[in-house]
């Protein structure tokens, strides 16, 4: 984790002047002037009664205010005197001192008061040197550290027993500790004290860094006893038009000319092709004049632009039909969605005087009229002799977002003599067990001289067809079955070939022994 | 391209009833008729009947009368043959066909315990 | 009902030859109006049928021309002029004229 701060509550290293601390009896410990390692004046406590046993020698801190502080910590420096190497003392010599610490809402202390013992006083621990000096060495410095908790008044006492130990107190220093602030994960946590236990873990909540989003929650870090953080919980990431900088402790705008699209980790990116940025923090890069972006398409794509128009388009015409064909725009506008649109205009008048208008509804495009995908349609049921123009028109994903109407290149044909129209219906005149006799009106657009009409038919259950051509507009079939259905269609020819059949017609014959229905007198000739 | 597209094989308990389907497709449905035809292994073909799709007027083979029910939805230009009181002497491949030319797949049905 | 009766077997046939496959009507199929109601079908393996052969002597559409069909009212000859190894299933031959229509219990094809 982070490293731990330390707090100071007291520390003699920097106090000049007399402590002046209450010592009990004043027989026992004694302040004096000494120098630290670095020769700095210090002042010092020290008790030194080993010739005389039953030692009991306390000595008291001043009153320290605990600032909202629940573990405090005790950094005691001191030498204790080897008690072998002093002659002629006593069995009751000790290497050891006593801690303890009371704790009070002001400075209530005094000369008799608490009474100097265990309870009220609390014993934080026995300290004994890691090592003594004997006479002939220089004083060896100990230092031990120790702590207590929890604490809750408004602050404390230290107080220090000698049982009969030959040493020198050199500094006291009491502190807490406390996480410092700190970034992770793109989020801020604040500075925070540990808890009352050196196992305790204090909950820090978080809150992202400027330009950083939540992607979990909720944010915490832990401060342990030792004032270092751990087991982040939740994080942030830069928010959309921002990317992470010194070492995820800062999300910084992405500069002008680059964007990022999504939150996260990831840097910020150059604007895709066609398009800028003019502005810091940008989430996505606009599009050049005369550049688009589809609805579909994401914020990391190109932009792109619409296809030029189609190129060689070629008419073939059949009659009232035609083909058109034609080849890939020469530029797709930087897209892979083209499709062809094919826009029908018939013209009246003659030559540059013409006025072309849309092409009527009845007008049949295969495979159809718009969003074509392959280079080809098949256009029928035109006028016959009649003039148009037609347009294929290239679009593509964008073409929808331009002002201007799709690019397109124009063809102008002129139909020619058509096939007739389909024979209206037909209708029976007669029937007997083996025939049927049928008469039709003439198509409705005949487009030319009508040569003959050639009838086909079958019979339901069979399903098998024949056919008979005939000269007039009816005919009589023969050969057929009794009590049997029949489907009959009927097409006229011209010299421009066969029009289309008419819809089926159902006709039954009747049985073998009923007699024939009433002939018609009236047979049309062509 | 003249299709028809028969429903999948049929496994019933005897006694039961099966309703077997033909989808017909490329043509007009209502100027052919649809007949049915069954297959028994080591027995040959037998007609069952012929229905007119347009009106539904059926003509039945004497010996599937009250056996087979044939209908038609003009809608899905589908046809349908009931075959009920089912027994073992059913289980067969049964087609149908438009007018006498296309057939369909056939459909196997198998009458067990 | 019109009973249609057929061979179970053909004559064993080498490929390349013709072949003859009979069928024989209890009743006349010549209608008043001069149409036989004759048909032949194949059934290859595994497979539905298939219309050869319709009104005794006219040719299926998609059908090879190497299939004929010929006969009188109540007796029948289909005839395969060079047989192929395609060729191979049951014949069957059919009575379109009066209900019921009946089948004939079907020829298979042999080849040596």
């Known amino acids: 984790g982070c490293r731990a701060l330390e707090e100071t509550l007291m520390d003699t290293k920097w106090v000049t002047s007399e402590l002046a601390w209450t010592s009990h009896p004043e027989s026992g410990w004694e302040e004096v002037s000494g120098y630290d390692e670095a020769m700095n004046p210090i002042r010092t406590y020290q008790v030194c009664n080993v010739r005389e046993s039953s030692q009991n020698n306390w000595l008291r801190t001043g009153f320290i205010w605990r600032r909202d502080v629940q573990r405090v910590y005790v950094e005691l420096k001191f030498t204790v005197r080897d008690c072998n190497s002093i002659p002629n003392i006593p069995g009751s010599c000790k290497e050891t001192f006593n801690l303890f610490y009371y704790e009070a809402d002001s400075d209530v202390a005094s000369a008799s008061s608490p009474f100097w013992m265990e309870n009220p006083y609390v014993k934080v621990d026995t300290i004994a040197p890691d090592e003594s000096f004997s006479r002939l060495d220089a004083g060896r410095v100990n230092t031990k550290v120790r702590s207590f908790g929890p604490l809750s008044k408004a602050g404390f006492y230290l107080a220090f027993q000698d049982q009969g130990a030959c040493m020198s107190l050199i500094s006291v220093r009491a502190f807490y500790k406390k996480c410092a602030s700190t970034t992770a994960g793109f989020a801020l946590f604040p500075e925070t004290l540990t808890g009352a236990e050196p196992t305790s873990l204090v909950i820090a909540p978080g809150t992202c860094i400027p330009n950083a989003v939540e992607v979990s929650v909720p944010l915490k870090l832990y401060c342990n006893g030792d004032g270092e953080w751990m087991v982040p919980v939740g994080a942030c990431t830069c928010a959309t038009g921002h990317e992470p900088a010194a070492k995820e402790s800062q999300c910084r705008p992405c500069p002008p000319g680059s964007y990022k699209a999504k939150q996260g980790e990831g840097p910020c990116l150059p604007c895709p092709p066609n398009s800028r940025t003019t502005s810091p923090a940008a989430s996505i890069c606009t599009c050049h004049n005369n550049f688009y972006r589809a609805d579909s398409d994401s914020a990391d794509s190109a932009c792109t632009t619409v296809p030029s128009p189609p190129r060689g388009v070629i008419s073939n015409v059949n009659e009232t039909s035609l083909i058109l064909e034609w080849s890939e725009p020469r530029d797709l506008g930087g897209r892979d969605d083209l499709l062809y649109n094919v826009i029908c205009k018939k013209c009246h008048g003659a030559g540059g005087a013409s006025a072309c208008s849309r092409c009527d509804d009845n007008v049949e495009f295969v495979p159809r009229q718009l969003g074509l995908t392959e280079r080809r349609v098949h256009i029928s049921h035109l006028l016959a002799h009649t003039r148009y123009t037609f347009e294929v028109q290239a679009v593509n994903g964008v073409s929808g977002k331009s002002p201007l109407p799709p690019r397109y290149a124009a063809v102008n044909i002129t139909t020619n003599q058509a096939a007739p129209s389909e024979v209206p219906t037909l209708r029976l005149h007669s029937s007997s067990g083996s025939s049927l006799t049928l008469s039709w009106a003439p198509p409705e657009r005949p487009n030319g001289v009508i040569l003959d009409y050639e009838m086909k038919y079958f019979e339901k259950s069979e399903g098998i067809a024949s056919t008979v051509t005939s000269q007039m507009n009816s005919v009589q079939l023969d050969g057929l079955r009794p009590d049997a259905r029949y489907v009959v269609q009927v097409r006229a020819r011209t010299v421009a070939g066969y029009g289309q059949y008419s819809r089926p017609a159902e006709f039954e014959t009747t049985s073998e022994r009923g007699s024939g229905a009433q002939q018609l007198q009236e047979q049309l000739p062509l | 391209e003249v299709q028809l597209q028969q429903s999948g094989a049929e496994l019933v308990m005897p006694g039961a009833s099966v309703k077997l389907s033909c989808k017909a497709s490329g043509y007009t449905f209502t100027s052919y008729y649809i007949h049915w035809v069954k297959q028994r292994p080591g027995q040959g073909l037998e007609w069952i009947g012929e229905?007119?799709?347009?009106?539904?007027?059926?003509n039945y083979n004497q010996k599937f009368k009250g056996k087979a029910t044939l209908t038609v939805d003009k809608s899905s230009s589908t046809a349908y043959m009931q075959l009920s009181s089912l027994t073992s002497e059913d289980s067969a491949v049964y087609y149908c066909?438009?007018?006498?030319?296309?057939w369909g797949q056939g459909t196997t049905l198998t009458v067990s315990s | 009902d019109i009973v249609m009766t057929q061979a179970a077997f053909s004559n064993p046939v080498t490929l390349g030859t013709s072949a003859s496959i009979s069928c024989r009507s209890s009743k006349s199929l010549l209608h008043s109006n001069g149409i036989t109601y004759l048909y032949w079908y194949l059934q290859k393996p595994g497979q539905s049928l298939q219309l050869l052969i319709y009104?005794?002597?006219n040719l299926a559409s998609g059908v090879p021309d190497r299939f004929s069909g010929s006969g009188s009212g109540t007796a029948f000859t289909l005839r395969i002029s060079r047989v192929e190894a395609e060729d191979v299933g049951v014949y069957y031959c059919?009575?379109?004229?009066?209900?019921?229509?009946?089948f004939g219990g079907g020829t298979k094809l042999e080849i040596k």
């Open positions: 066909t438009r007018g006498i030319t296309n």
């Open positions: 009104r005794m002597s």
């Open positions: 229905i007119d799709p347009s009106d539904s007027y059926t």
């Open positions: 059919m009575q379109h004229l009066e209900y019921p229509f009946t």
